[in-house]
Interface confidence: low
């Protein structure tokens, strides 16, 4: 985990006036001056009853504020006699002494108060040193580190009790621990204290650095009783157009030129073709003037532009249709979802001042009019000596993006005459029992004056054509047999030749005894 | 770690048709163009032209739009590029290569007979 | 088409020897759009140089690039026998995209 941070709460080490603790009895620490191990002069407390047995000798600290702080650390500095180099002592010299505290809400203790024991003193531990040394060594100097706490009051007291040593206590330091500010995963999370204990995890919410977003929540990290970080718990990642820099400690705006479409932890890139970022920070890259992103198109595409127009456009003209075929377009801007529409347009007028609009809609174009794939279109249903202008856009996905109409490419024709459209109905006027009166309505579509019309009939059971010739949309058939029923059909002919027949209809002529003509309600085509 | 992998070799006949393939891994293959260069034996680096692998939008250099026609799978992170009516001048090494800096080793194509 | 063209074509160098590789455009280019590339004998081109100055990940601080407008450069600071290749400039900024004739850096 990241380094722990310790906090002073009270060192020895920096005092060069009179610690002045209280010790009991009197005979017992004494306060002197003397040097650490980098020469700085200390002041420490010493103490070597060692030739009187049953010694119980206390040192007690002023009073150190606790700071909201649950667990205490000190750190000892001393130096023991090995009780074997000191000659004629009795068996009750000791290599050891012991820690203590005493908490209490203001600097109420006095030389009488607490009492001097264990009880209301809480120990700590016991402290035996990793070295002692005899009168012929240099004074080996000990460091020990013991932890005390929950602590719930204003402050505390720290005690130490000799019962026969002889040592010098060269530096007491009382520090607590506290996990450092840090950044994990984009995260920014605060100092924090260590708990009560030193299993304890102390949660520490966190925040995402600037220009970073959170990807899994909640966003939280554990401060262990050493003042260590562990188990991260969610993370945050760099927004989109910020990229991760000084080991994830940061997270940098994307350099002008470059852009970064999705948040996490990927590099700024260089813009596509045919875009670009005047500002620092792009999640996206502008298209230069006349390319466009379809909406479909991701931040990563290339810009792209409209097709030029169609090439090669060829007309065939039969009649009132004719079939258009043209060549891909020079130039596809980049793109494959190329696309053709046709659009008619009907001109009056003779030459250049001629006016031109939209066709009538019921001009028919197979496949369609318009979203081609294929690159021919059928049209039929125009009229007969007609001009007409087709034009030809080549779209894309990003036309609708461009200010400008699709490019096409324009034809020009003109078409011929067509023969007249069939016969729409017959109609029966009358009957007898050799003849039928029949009449009808003229074709929807001429295409030009119609010369005449021509009849087919036969006499159902024997299926042997007649046909006769009628300028007039109406005709009188003679010499029919009676009780017999017929097929007819008619056509009209115009100089562009004879259109297609009307579709057969049935009629019959009446019984010999009937009495003069039958009038028939008309008869629509079966 | 990123890897655009190719195969490494291919031998054809004049006047056939080639398909090479191009796998990347271990990242979001939709996420950056695909590029394809050319790279005849001691000669420069030419640039064919590019895919989009999210929508399979391409650009090509012209010099090569009717040789070269560049398509992908995104279903197995695979970017194609079909070398057409092949003769003795498409023998060369045929690099993929993705932004930012990710290179294929190159497949060498060998137009013989 | 915006053509490249880099000078010299091949310059043989000792160890140690400070090395500029130049780039020229037929038309003017976004330093943004500007690239350089490194290419050993038998392997495909590795990225170098991206953006004009900013060097890609796992290169040597020895390589640098500068320039804008139609003149860039690539320098080497100290070179190493390790960096004899072919140097290749390419630019980004219009399709095609394109590439210098190349650099070859030779040991002397």
């Known amino acids: 985990g990241c380094r722990a941070l310790e906090e002073t709460l009270m060192d020895t080490k920096w005092v060069t006036s009179e610690l002045a603790w209280t010790s009991h009895p009197e005979s017992g620490w004494e306060e002197v001056s003397g040097y650490d191990e980098a020469m700085n002069p200390i002041r420490t407390y010493q103490v070597c009853n060692v030739r009187e047995s049953s010694q119980n000798n206390w040192l007690r600290t002023g009073f150190i504020w606790r700071r909201d702080v649950q667990r205490v650390y000190v750190e000892l500095k001393f130096t023991v006699r090995d009780c074997n180099s000191i000659p004629n002592i009795p068996g009750s010299c000791k290599e050891t002494f012991n820690l203590f505290y005493y908490e209490a809400d203001s600097d109420v203790a006095s030389a009488s108060s607490p009492f001097w024991m264990e009880n209301p003193y809480v120990k700590v531990d016991t402290i035996a040193p990793d070295e002692s040394f005899s009168r012929l060594d240099a004074g080996r100097v000990n460091t020990k580190v013991r932890s005390f706490g929950p602590l719930s009051k204003a402050g505390f007291y720290l005690a130490f009790q000799d019962q026969g040593a002889c040592m010098s206590l060269i530096s007491v330091r009382a520090f607590y621990k506290k996990c450092a500010s840090t950044t994990a995963g984009f995260a920014l999370f605060p100092e924090t204290l260590t708990g009560a204990e030193p299993t304890s995890l102390v949660i520490a919410p966190g925040t995402c650095i600037p220009n970073a977003v959170e990807v899994s929540v909640p966003l939280k990290l554990y401060c262990n009783g050493d003042g260590e970080w562990m188990v991260p718990v969610g993370a945050c990642t760099c927004a989109t157009g910020h990229e991760p820099a000084a080991k994830e400690s940061q997270c940098r705006p994307c350099p002008p030129g470059s852009y970064k479409a999705k948040q996490g932890e990927g590099p700024c890139l260089p813009c596509p073709p045919n875009s670009r970022t005047t500002s620092p920070a792009a999640s996206i890259c502008t298209c230069h003037n006349n390319f466009y992103r379809a909406d479909s198109d991701s931040a990563d595409s290339a810009c792209t532009t409209v097709p030029s127009p169609p090439r090669g456009v060829i007309s065939n003209v039969n009649e009132t249709s004719l079939i258009l075929e043209w060549s891909e377009p020079r130039d596809l801007g980049g793109r494959d979802d190329l696309l053709y529409n046709v659009i008619c347009k009907k001109c009056h007028g003779a030459g250049g001042a001629s006016a031109c609009s939209r066709c009538d809609d019921n001009v028919e174009f197979v496949p369609r009019q318009l979203g081609l794939t294929e690159r021919r279109v059928h049209i039929s249903h125009l009229l007969a000596h007609t001009r007409y202008t087709f034009e030809v856009q080549a779209v894309n996905g990003v036309s609708g993006k461009s200010p400008l109409p699709p490019r096409y490419a324009a034809v020009n024709i003109t078409t011929n005459q067509a023969a007249p459209s069939e016969v729409p109905t017959l109609r029966l006027h009358s009957s007898s029992g050799s003849s039928l009166t029949l009449s009808w309505a003229p074709p929807e579509r001429p295409n030009g004056v119609i010369l005449d019309y021509e009849m087919k009939y036969f006499e159902k059971s024997e299926g042997i054509a007649s046909t006769v010739t009628s300028q007039m949309n109406s005709v009188q058939l003679d010499g029919l047999r009676p009780d017999a029923r017929y097929v007819v059909q008619v056509r009209a002919r115009t100089v562009a030749g004879y259109g297609q027949y009307s579709r057969p209809a049935e009629f019959e002529t009446t019984s010999e005894r009937g009495s003069g003509a039958q009038q028939l309600q008309e008869q629509l085509p079966l | 770690q990123v890897q655009v992998q190719q195969p490494g070799a291919e031998l054809v006949k004049p006047g056939a048709s080639v398909k090479l393939s191009c796998r990347a891994s271990?990242?979001?293959?939709?996420?950056?163009?695909m590029h394809w260069v050319k790279q005849r034996p001691g000669q420069g680096l030419e640039w064919i032209g590019n895919v989009n692998p999210s929508n399979g939008g391409t650009n090509y250099n012209e010099k090569f739009k009717s040789k070269a026609t560049l398509t992908v799978d995104k279903s197995s992170n695979t970017a194609y590029m079909q070398l057409s009516s092949l003769t003795s001048e498409d023998s060369a090494v045929y690099y993929c290569?993705?932004?930012?800096?990710?290179w294929g080793q190159g497949t060498t194509l060998t137009v013989s007979s | 088409e915006i053509v490249l063209t880099q000078s010299p074509t091949t310059m043989a160098a000792s160890p140690g020897e400070k090395i500029t590789i130049t780039c020229s455009a037929s038309s003017s280019i976004s330093s943004n759009y500007l690239h350089w590339y490194q290419q050993k004998p038998g392997f495909s081109p590795k990225l170098l140089i991206y953006r004009t100055s900013n060097l890609a990940s796992g290169v040597p601080a020895r390589f640098s690039g500068s320039g804008s407008g139609t003149s860039y450069s690539l320098t080497i600071g100290t070179m190493e026998a390790e960096d004899v290749a072919t140097y290749y400039c390419?630019?980004?900024?219009?399709?095609?995209?394109?590439f210098g004739a190349g650099t070859k850096l030779e040991l002397k």
């Open positions: 271990d990242y979001t293959f939709t996420s950056y163009w």
């Open positions: 390419q630019q980004g900024s219009s399709i095609p995209l394109t």
């Open positions: 290569a993705s932004n930012p800096g990710y």
